[in-house]
């Protein structure tokens, strides 16, 4: 028996075709995914192949205006209108607190939600009973197949659940789940999930009676032969993983942000054992029709964001200097404003030993686009920041060792002077730089904000400790010659959207006045 | 090499049965949809229906429909069109053509060379 | 069914000659639209497809445009061995649907 197991994962709110970047679409003639060409590939292959599901790792919130706007109605509606079999929640599901989860997607989605190892406690128990499940038995032509959902543990500490959710091991979460479905007749097992690409791989290795597993978070691209577009594969499509018991269990996960579609075959014996694997990501290029009715949907929808860009998040009543003579050169405010929104983004206090988990930001200077000038009212647009922040990145969260950090800032001023991007601005650190030293020893002061701590203040940087840091998804990809953070990087979770990051801090303050304290001196 | 060879010219009466083939190689058969083309003499070119061999699903053309089949056998990786009764009408020069649903090229990579079918009492 | 309007049905044109063939869908098809061209006693051949993505060993003369229900195959300097007959067909919906056929002859 032959199943066909379409994927997505990571899309992040690329409702529209995008870049070959996945930035936002600038030459139609080139651009990729989006929701319209992905319901045409679908369309395709439902109408060639008898026993075909449509799955989703997570991750379909937060990434651009589309959420921002619409905050996951967008969505619940597209998805539906794709008839998705079913989607694995994501971290960024819970963004919007469980309440912006419940609403636009719980309620409204006609496809099960799930995650086995999301366990919900006290008054929340009752009012989401029932809306996301553990597992879902799904009829397939005339099979069975149960997919069982996982979300990263890590989820409290990379977006907003609340307190009434606690996330269990994923391992030990779904081996019950797991043998339920067995107990249920249940032959053939999907574990769909957002946990990275390790987690899935540890999955497929340990959770006995799992045949496929099919994965997010870590925005992984695997291909079988020579890839398409600019990824580079991390290993085959499917990954094989040899299970505890013997088996051979094919991984997979489609990238991210809508840009290929996941595309996996499986042979299955009358017991259920996976006789054969393969398959391969296709690129949803400008080559593949957007599907015209999907398409004219999108363009209703967007109306509204076209309105809402213009309109006011809230006030500067000082000039927000994002000069490439001020950001790449010194202190700017507009790289305290950015960093602080950063670090804002980020508050979760969840250990009393702790009054955050993490305090510090490194941001680069040629990032920093667009200064925005205050005597227009002061009035702060989404606009207005689409041009500080034009690249549609995030903003992430890694965990370096001090070391790291010291060779990254020794990089920020290696070549000083020359208006390069590489120059960093800063949250939670104060930097001293004496320039009259050689290129990689032109730190003399380095200290950082504790977290460990009921009264934050700034200690040395310690080279062995390791530390969190909010940071541009581009410089936790080595871009600007950080190649230091990308090799040595100990862990990595993608964040928000940078506008939706600065956005919500201005509206959230209402006025703003960021200045230049001091962050970054020079001897 | 990717080759689509069609089987040889046919000539029948009318009320005659008939089934061409067309067999695929140098490529995964059952990964590509077949179509089958019709070109009446001196006339342009009619999509007759399709077949995805994988799954055996069949999609026609409603002018076709009921007037011919298409079938497959994916062990010999060949296509087959087939004539229950033919008319003078159906005389034709017909071509199988591929069709790749797991690209991106919106069309027929590869025909065969046609099969010419003259019906005439 | 989509009809595909294909114009002119016959063309004269000299070998360097820019020769452009229109076809027009009775609805939005989405630029899934394909063009072939047909030798007399041969099989048609795949130039381009999805309106502007010329097909693998076609030479860059050949060229494709076009968006919701306008499409046009473009030969930018006719050579000996174009003269033949050109097919649009749209891939969008079936019945898939061809046009008339542009027979380019000799002048």
């Known amino acids: 028996w032959e199943l066909t197991i379409l994927h997505t994962n990571d899309v992040h709110s690329r409702l529209e075709q995008t870049s070959e970047d996945s930035s936002k679409c600038v030459n139609a003639s080139r651009c990729m995914g989006g929701v319209a060409r992905l319901f045409t590939k679908v369309q395709q292959i439902r109408r060639a192949e008898p026993n075909v599901l449509l799955l989703d790792a997570g991750d379909q919130y937060q990434g651009t205006i589309w959420f921002t706007v619409y905050k996951g109605a967008e969505v619940a509606h597209f998805m539906n209108a794709l008839r998705y079999d079913a989607m694995a929640l994501g971290n960024h599901e819970f963004d919007n607190g469980v309440e912006g989860l419940i609403e636009p997607l719980l309620k409204e989605a006609k496809f099960p939600i799930l995650s086995a190892n999301i366990k919900a406690k006290g008054p929340l128990a009752s009012q989401i009973s029932g809306l996301y499940l553990p597992y879902k038995v799904l009829p397939v032509g005339d099979e069975v197949v149960g997919i069982v959902g996982y979300t990263s543990k890590e989820t409290p500490f990379l977006s907003n659940p609340g307190t009434n959710l606690v996330f269990e091991d994923e391992i030990t979460a779904l081996q019950p789940e797991v043998d339920k479905l067995k107990t249920l007749n249940v032959n053939k097992i999907i574990a769909l999930g957002h946990s990275g690409f390790e987690m899935d791989k540890l999955i497929a290795q340990k959770v006995r009676g799992v045949d496929v597993v099919v994965g997010g978070h870590s925005n992984t691209f695997l291909y079988t032969g020579n890839p398409p577009s600019k990824e580079v594969p991390a290993g085959k499509y499917p990954f094989i993983v040899t299970s505890d018991d013997g088996r051979k269990v094919p991984v997979v996960q489609a990238y991210a942000f809508g840009k290929y579609l996941g595309y996996l075959k499986i042979e299955f014996d009358e017991r259920g054992n996976v006789i054969s694997s393969h398959g391969n990501p296709i690129l949803l290029n400008s080559s593949i029709p957007e599907d015209p009715s999907i398409k004219a949907d999108i363009n209703k929808w967007r109306i509204k964001l076209d309105n809402y860009s213009t309109q006011e998040l809230g006030k500067t009543i000082v000039y927000l200097d994002g000069s490439s003579q001020s950001c790449r050169f010194r202190e700017c405010n507009m790289g305290n404003l950015i960093c602080d929104a950063m670090i804002n983004n980020n508050l979760r206090h969840t250990d009393e030993m702790f009054w955050n988990h993490v305090s510090m930001c490194i941001l680069n200077g040629g990032g920093i686009r667009s200064p925005i000038d205050e005597r227009n009212n002061g009035t702060i647009t989404w606009e207005n920041l689409a041009a500080v922040l034009p690249f549609g990145g995030t903003f992430d969260l890694v965990q370096l060792k001090g070391s790291t950090l010291k060779k990254a800032f020794e990089h920020s001023v290696h070549r000083y002077g020359q208006s390069t991007g590489e120059f960093l601005q800063v949250g939670g650190i104060h930097v001293v730089y004496d320039l009259s030293r050689k290129p990689g020893d032109r730190v003399v002061k380095l200290d950082v904000l504790c977290t460990k701590c009921r009264v934050p203040s700034y200690d040395p940087l310690k080279m062995d400790e390791v530390y969190k840091v909010i940071l541009p998804n581009f410089l936790a990809n080595g871009g600007d010659g950080f190649q230091m953070i990308k090799d040595e990087l100990l862990r990595h979770d993608s964040g928000d959207q940078d506008i939706n990051v600065v956005s919500t801090y201005i509206s959230k303050m209402k006025v703003i006045y960021p200045a230049v304290e001091g962050r970054i001196k020079f001897s | 090499e990717v080759q689509l060879v069609q089987s040889g010219a046919e000539v029948k009466k009318p009320g005659e049965s008939l089934k061409i083939s067309c067999k695929g190689s140098?490529?995964?058969?059952?990964?590509?949809?077949l179509s089958w083309v019709r070109q009446m003499p001196g006339k342009g070119l009619e999509w007759m229906g399709e077949i995805y061999p994988g799954s055996g699903n069949t999609y026609y053309n409603e002018k076709f429909k009921g007037q011919v089949t298409i079938s497959a056998d994916k062990s010999i990786s060949t296509a087959y069109l087939q004539w229950s009764s033919l008319k003078a009408s159906d005389t034709a020069m017909y071509y199988c053509?591929?069709?790749?649903?797991?690209?991106?090229?919106?069309?027929?990579?590869?025909w065969g060379a046609g099969t010419t079918v003259t019906v005439s009492s | 069914d989509i009809q595909m309007t294909q114009s002119p049905s016959s063309l004269s044109a000299s070998v360097g000659d820019r020769v452009t063939i229109t076809c027009k869908a009775s609805?939005?098809?989405?630029?899934?639209v394909a063009w072939y061209q047909q030798k007399p006693g041969k099989a048609p051949k795949l130039l381009l497809y999805?309106?502007?993505y010329r097909y693998s060993g076609v030479p860059s003369r050949f060229s494709g445009s076009g968006s919701g229900t306008d499409y046009t195959l473009t030969i930018s300097s006719l050579q000996p061995e174009d003269f033949a007959t050109y097919y649009c067909?749209?891939?969008?919906?079936?019945?898939?649907?061809f046009g008339g056929g542009t027979k380019l002859e000799i002048k």
């Open positions: 067909q749209q891939h969008y919906n079936t019945p898939y649907t």
């Open positions: 609805q939005d098809v989405s630029t899934a």
């Open positions: 999805s309106a502007s």
């Open positions: 140098g490529y995964t058969f059952t990964s590509y949809g």
């Open positions: 053509a591929r069709y790749d649903y797991l690209g991106s090229s919106y069309g027929f990579d590869y």
